[in-house]
């Protein structure tokens, strides 16, 4: 598989087949499950150097593994996009032998004199063809050669063949399936040959070609796949419930911020609450997590106001749960990114000398920005996209607050709306889909570069819209939510989150 | 064919020093362990160490009765196996070979004809 | 290191017999399902020669009479039914560990 190791080296050589027998439209769905999969590498922080080859006839050699841009993969992807169908139209032929060698010429090395760490750079090549070579001769001999030169299967004690990956994407009206299979690699429990069929849902077959066990720890990453769970999709989201004897219980969400900790928001305990009876559950586990404290934070106080006839205050409206245990990471529970912290810094492809102020401006804008939050619906995990109002639209969401229950008697809306916190709801952009309950504590995130980065804790809404869980389908305009910045908490986050590795800046 | 030709040897005094050849040809050198074994006048086969493949970086090992005064290195370009030997005694009096070690199952498959180091004043 | 103890250290047979001859380790040499011992032979004035690797594989161009059998700690060399050229000295080698190690060797005599 492609072991996705940011710490790690590798070459990816993309060979794409633009002879007679392929069709335009076919190489340009080739391209695109190529951009895809350089996208989704990328994501990963994983930063390979790309080899990319179209050929017919005669190869053509885009972008070589030596050159300096080779391992951006924007820059990549810009050349793959420019490259037409009709670049190989005069030699039509197919000479896959000769493409898989200039697939070699970029592996050697001059004078046979191997540079530094090349036995610890992995090589993946995807083919993408229909397998109807009619020139050259047999491109396998030129898979031994590749094996050969990269020491592969020669060294019973160290075979190395987790150093060489052919995946082979048969595409074309018709594919000598035969052919195909013998260019692939052959690993046990592993699949390196995929159909025309497969490439419809991408993330399947990414699915089954990439290794992420080096990078489980890595926040904010999904996993789409149609086979994947809930939790596949929201592996951060974590259950909260907190029994009261004789009070029933309450329900809140949450999010994994690192292996002991889940960012909540405070409202969802009394500080009468014991450990013992506040149940976490994550990854949709049965079992509960036993939890060593939760930590409040300290400018947190909901009876803050009420001599000032505000009956409720949720300003600074977060806290953490400390585990008992550590998590353990996997592709069902890992963590979700925090603003201003290098990993963040990192999922955003951002330089390393990127500022907090710099990762605030990329990630909350003063503009509408596209967000989501993530409800339980009928025991089902659902995205909601909402739009959080950070522009023009700022100051009529945040005045909406009003109309909420207890309200209704505050003289300056700032009272109750703090710069701690993000609105969202209302029907301009768009609808928002509004929060209920239940949702509480859980993350508001915005998502980008195919990554989830948390920028804000549910605390608060103004219409109640989920009358018996369910959400009502009309809802009025003034009908906002109220989610605390983690901007605006940072000081806090870093002091309690201080041993967690996550290098805040 | 396979070819291992050892050169070097002859009479030394103790406390001196010597090298050793073994020139290949017939396979592609650098993907192969190659080894040094001795064999002192009707005495047993002792393995001396050996030179890794290209993957180790030709990184050598040794056996503990020489480390620290015999040296293996190789030189790709001209597929031949050196051993240096220094502070020579008289125990180190024997036949050497060299032998390819085969990394596809770890075994000495090809060895040379040997050569005789007498270390004697 | 590993120790490699062949026993016996001289064996008599005539030829047409069953000669067997043990090497035992000191400790494991196997090593994720292979068993990483090698028997050699030698004969007066001449080079080893690669007779069995990896516990049981008949090196080509040796003759079918020879084979190896053994894991872990305790291995033997067959030669089923002995020839005249068999007279030789048998040494086992292990390959699992650095360093090699040879065993002290078993001198096969031919009546």
């Known amino acids: 598989k492609i072991v996705l190791d940011p710490s790690g080296s590798m070459n990816i050589y993309l060979v794409l087949d633009g002879s007679d027998s392929i069709g335009a439209s076919n190489f340009t769905g080739a391209k695109k499950c190529l951009v895809n999969l350089i996208e989704k590498v990328a994501s990963y922080g994983v930063k390979p150097r790309y080899g990319l080859v179209t050929y017919a006839t005669y190869p053509k050699i885009w972008v070589k593994v030596s050159e300096a841009d080779s391992s951006n993969a924007d820059w990549v992807t810009k050349q793959l996009n420019e490259i037409n169908y009709e670049d190989h139209k005069l030699k039509s032929g197919t000479n896959t032998k000769k493409a898989l060698q200039a697939v070699y010429s970029m592996m050697s090395w001059p004078d046979d004199v191997p540079p530094e760490g090349w036995n610890r750079t992995r090589h993946v090549i995807i083919l993408m063809t229909d397998g109807l070579h009619n020139m050259g001769g047999d491109p396998i001999t030129v898979i031994d050669e590749i094996r050969d030169l990269l020491y592969i299967g020669k060294d019973r004690k160290n075979p190395r063949e987790d150093y060489l990956d052919v995946y082979v994407f048969g595409v074309g009206p018709l594919v000598n399936q035969v052919n195909i299979n013998a260019l692939a690699s052959k690993k046990d429990n592993e699949q390196h040959v995929f159909k025309v069929k497969d490439m419809e849902n991408l993330e399947d077959v990414f699915y089954q070609m990439i290794d992420e066990s080096q990078s489980l720890s890595l926040c904010g990453m999904v996993w789409e796949h149609r086979k994947g769970t809930d939790y596949h999709k929201q592996p951060w989201q974590a259950k909260i419930s907190v029994i009261r004897p004789s009070k029933g219980h309450e329900s809140c969400m949450g999010a994994v911020v690192s292996e002991y900790f889940v960012l909540t928001a405070a409202h969802c305990f009394t500080v009468d609450d014991k450990e013992h009876s506040i149940k976490v559950s994550v990854g949709g586990e049965k079992r509960d997590l036993e939890i060593e404290v939760v930590l409040f934070h300290p400018n947190y106080n909901i009876n803050g106001k009420k001599e000032a006839g505000i009956p409720e205050f949720y300003d600074y409206d977060v806290a953490l749960i400390k585990l008992k245990n550590k998590l353990k990471y996997g592709q069902t529970i890992r963590p979700i990114c925090l603003p201003c912290t290098e990993g963040t810094t990192r999922a955003l492809r951002l330089p390393p000398t990127t500022t907090c102020q710099q990762q605030k401006e990329e990630l909350l804008p003063a503009q509408d920005i596209k967000a989501l939050f993530v409800s339980e619906e009928e025991k089902k995990l659902t995205r909601k996209e909402v739009y959080i109002k950070n522009g023009d639209k700022k100051g009529s969401c945040e005045r909406d607050a009003q109309y909420a229950p207890g309200y209704d008697k505050v003289k300056d809306i700032s009272e109750v709306v703090t710069p701690r916190f993000l609105c969202t709801g209302g029907v301009s952009p768009y609808a928002d889909p509004n929060t209920c309950r239940g949702d509480s504590g859980g993350p508001l995130i915005v998502h980008k570069r195919s990554r989830f980065i948390q920028v804000g804790v549910i605390s608060w809404g103004v219409v109640d819209v989920c009358k018996n869980q369910k959400r009502q389908k009309q809802v009025p305009a003034h009908a906002r939510d109220f989610h605390i910045n983690l901007f605006q908490v940072l000081p806090w986050l870093k002091e309690k989150l201080q041993d967690e590795d996550l290098g805040f800046l | 064919e396979v070819q291992l030709v050892e050169s070097g040897g002859g009479l030394v005094q103790p406390g001196g020093s010597l090298r050793l050849s073994c020139a290949t040809s017939g396979f592609t050198f650098r993907d192969y362990y190659m080894s040094w074994v001795r064999q002192a006048p009707g005495k047993g086969l002792e393995w001396l160490g050996f030179s890794r493949h290209r993957v180790y970086g030709y990184t050598p090992e040794y056996a503990a009765s020489v480390k620290g005064r015999f040296t293996i290195s190789r030189d790709n370009s001209k597929n031949t196996l050196y051993l240096q030997m220094n502070s020579l005694k008289t125990e180190d009096t024997a036949v050497y070979y060299c032998?390819?070690?085969?990394?596809?199952?770890?075994?000495?498959?090809?060895w040379g004809q040997g050569t005789l180091v007498t270390v004697s004043s | 290191e590993i120790v490699l103890t062949q026993s016996p250290a001289t064996l008599s047979l005539s030829p047409g017999e069953r000669a067997t001859l043990s090497c035992k380790a000191s400790q494991s040499v196997d090593y994720d399902g292979d068993s990483y011992m090698n028997w050699y032979q030698q004969k007066p004035g001449q080079a080893p020669r690669l007779l069995i690797y990896a516990a049981s594989n008949l090196e080509s161009g040796i003759p079918a009479r020879f084979s190896g059998s053994g894991s872990g700690t305790d291995f033997t060399l067959t030669i089923s039914s002995l020839e005249p050229e068999d007279g030789a000295t048998y040494y086992c080698q292990q390959s699992n560990a650095d360093p090699y190690t040879f065993g002290q060797g078993t001198k096969l005599e031919i009546k």
């Open positions: 032998a390819r070690d085969n990394p596809g199952y770890y075994a000495m498959d090809y």
